[in-house]
Interface confidence: medium
Amino acid sequence: DPVKPSRGPLVTCTCESPHCKGPTCRGAWCTVVLVREEGRHPQEHRGCGNLHRELCRGRPTEFVNHYCCDSHLCNHNVSLVLEATQPPSEQPGTDGQ
């Protein structure tokens, strides 16, 4: 349910973002998001996902790359790049769902 707090099996993920309680979090899947805001350097956030699984399937753009995975600490060593510097054949933002 996209509104209620999530229930169900959770996976432990590396958490590295301004909103992390600690070094790990638990969610329905793990995420890595690389975002470049106008006039700023890209910032990479690692954490947990509970909603909007469809974002995992989005192709990288020059502003955002959204990566998801489903196993224990699977987002720990993932590094993303944005579309402007990445050949189409090497895009890691794929999601099996």
């Epitope: 349910d1 707090p5 509970n50 909603l51």
Partner: antibody
Framework: EVQLVGSGGGVVQPGRSLRLSCAAS????????MHWVRQAPGKGLEWVAV????????YYADSVKGRFTISRDNSKNTLYLQMNSLRAEDTAVYYC??????????????WGQGTLVTVSS | LPVLTQPPSASGTPGQRVTISCSGS????????VNWYHQLPGSAPKLLIY???LRPSGVPDRFSGSKSGTSASLAISRFQSGDEADYYC???????????FGTGTKLTVL
């Protein structure tokens, strides 16, 4: 910058209808669940309704269930609250609000300025 | 009966530590995270604490949240006159399928 601008408030007679709108800007509207919260004059906050990012899930407070309908038009970046069979106790400032982050169960993180609805004969 | 109960008022002197309680049940505070909002007169509410004890950026570290069982607390250390406001706790309620706010606490400076 997240901006939520409510409109459509005013004075209405008991039993009549009113539709509130909330124009959203500064973020990808279609990614976020949205709430309506109201506050009667001199009283506390009362949650009214919530709608999921895609409109597939809606929940209502018991006090408005069957009378109010929350909806959204993601192509217009607009949230709505259709209020029917209005009562004097529906008199309040109605706040449109966005959740803080994508995750389910996210708290309300951003609030509009509020629009006043007065139900009076 | 209110779902989340707060004391109607609280007060403190500048520099003091002030605490506001919020009492609920297993279907809300006991099973879901607690959020705190404050509201200055004539303004929209503002998120102060979320996820029981997390502060949004821009909120001073003088504000802290905690939870134990079906009760939650908001603590304000080094209380200031600018902290005078109405404070509300909130949480999702699984039984009601609703987001519920506390009754609110008016915090004043002595």
């Amino acid at each position: 910058e997240v901006q939520l601008v409510g409109s459509g408030g005013g004075v209405v007679q008991p039993g009549r209808s009113l539709r509130l709108s909330c124009a959203a800007s500064g973020f990808t509207f279609s990614n976020y669940a949205m709430h309506w919260v109201r506050q009667a004059p001199g009283k506390g906050l009362e949650w009214v309704a919530v709608i999921s990012y895609d409109g597939s899930n809606k929940y209502y407070a018991d006090s408005v269930k069957g009378r109010f309908t929350i909806s959204r038009d993601n192509s217009k970046n607009t949230l709505y609250l259709q209020m029917n069979s209005l009562r004097a106790e529906d008199t309040a400032v109605y706040y449109c609000a966005r959740v803080r982050y994508y995750g389910s169960g996210s708290p309300i993180g951003y609030w509009g300025q509020g629009t006043l609805v007065t139900v009076s004969s | 009966l209110p779902v989340l109960t707060q004391p109607p008022s609280a007060s403190g002197t500048p520099g003091q530590r002030v605490t506001i309680s919020c009492s609920g049940s297993s279907s809300n505070i006991g099973g879901n995270t607690v959020n705190w909002y404050h509201q200055l007169p004539g303004s929209a509410p503002k998120l102060l604490i979320y996820g029981d004890d997390l502060r949004p950026s821009g909120v001073p570290d003088r504000f802290s949240g905690s939870k134990s069982g079906t009760s939650a607390s908001l603590a304000i250390s080094r209380f200031q006159s600018g902290d005078e406001a109405d404070y509300y706790c909130a949480a999702w309620d699984d039984s009601l399928n609703a987001y519920v706010f506390g009754t609110g606490t008016k915090l004043t400076v002595l």
